[in-house]
Amino acid sequence: SEVEYRAEVGQNAYLPCFYTPAAPGNLVPVCWGKGACPVFECGNVVLRTDERDVNYWTSRYWLNGDFRKGDVSLTIENVTLADSGIYCCRIQIPGIMNDEKFNLKLVIKPAKVTPAPTRQRDFTAAFPRMLTTRGHGPAETQTLGSLPDINLTQISTLANELRDSRLANDLRDSGATIR
């Protein structure tokens, strides 16, 4: 079953996906599509990378992470309720049926207009399923870049850890505490 991620209307959504290039600069094509991963390729492609860069994208979809080191996590800008659904991250490893496929479920909640303290309580209540809607700049990508090599079976664990660490950053930045 797919892992669930959440965001509010009007915010940016973040869907994690990672792989480790076999060697520096030896990138693998990746596609992101709306809808569960089919047998081949991605359906309803929203973004695609090749051996060097992002070579196709549609409005509001982009890679904010260090995709040349394997962080191909998708950012969806200014989400609406229509963005809810399953997204496929497909790492197109050369060879027959070698692709790694990840289905991620994005749940969009209506925006809440509430004072700051309530918003901080929401952060805590959503833990650990809260989706960060704010990146933390170059330091974050440098940290990712220095992670030890991982294999594809570890991606799901890494995604969960990253999501939780991003939440921790958001909680810290908002003044909330983690218990």
């Epitope: 520096p24 600069g25 051996e51 860069d53 994208w57 982009w62 890679l63 904010n64 260090d66 990508t141």
Partner: antibody, heavy 120, light 107 residues
């Protein structure tokens, strides 16, 4: 040390072709992309395309597709850029530039430039 | 293709000044922006890569920052040898595009 040495200046007539060479030394030629960038007189920089010597893969700026071809000779560590059907607005300095993984494919070394003048 | 809008076109400076120039991408390019310096009759030189990383041997008075669509390049204390044209470039997606350049000139 890393060096990219380009061929000399060329004067061509409209409709002709030009082939510029870029000889690399001081690094493993096949490990880095070679991009080509041009600069018209008093103007900014414009990307023409790249070639990856290791696999021979190329990517060209759509604006030049059908007119530009990039090749390499691995035995001499030389990259070539050929531009066909030249027009007067192709008059520019043409640079080869090394795109490396560790600089995120920005250009850490540039050739000295080759001036191509297209004039009747 | 992604348009890189660079401002200002000209920047009058005196030695010791702190100067800042900006580049705005027409769509998000993550951190995939480089800054180059070009002096008359010379090839461009890489100063900053991946938005904020100083290239080897580049003095620490040169700094870059930003991500997404807005990028800034700063020289903390301009030296005479810094008089040149500075270009930003996105290398997120081909065709890779450059800003139109900012020329540093004496006040």
């Amino acid at each position: 040390q890393v060096q990219l040495v380009q061929s000399g200046a060329e004067v061509k007539k409209p409709g002709a072709s030009v082939k510029v060479s870029c000889k690399a030394s001081g690094y493993t030629f096949t490990d880095y992309y070679m991009d080509w960038v041009r600069q018209a007189p008093g103007q900014g920089l414009e990307w023409l395309g790249y070639i990856y010597p290791n696999k021979g893969g190329t990517s060209y700026n759509q604006k030049f597709k059908g007119r530009v071809t990039m090749t390499t000779d691995k035995s001499t560590s030389t990259a070539y850029m050929e531009l066909r059907s030249l027009r007067s607005d192709d008059t520019a300095v043409y640079y080869c530039a090394r795109g490396g993984y560790y600089s995120y494919y920005s250009y850490d070394y540039w050739g000295q430039g080759t001036t191509v003048t297209v004039s009747s | 293709s992604i348009v890189m809008t660079q401002t200002p076109k000209f920047l009058p400076v005196s030695a010791g000044d702190r100067v800042t120039m900006t580049c705005k991408a027409s769509q998000s390019v993550g951190n995939n922006v480089a800054w180059y310096q070009q002096k008359p009759g010379q090839s461009p030189k890489l100063l900053i890569y991946y938005a904020s990383n100083r290239y080897t041997g580049v003095p620490d008075r040169f700094t870059g920052s930003g991500s997404g669509t807005d990028f800034t390049f700063t020289i903390s204390s301009v030296q005479v040898e810094d008089l040149a044209v500075y270009f930003c470039q996105q290398h997120y997606s081909s065709p890779y595009t450059f800003g139109t350049g900012t020329k540093l000139e004496i006040k």
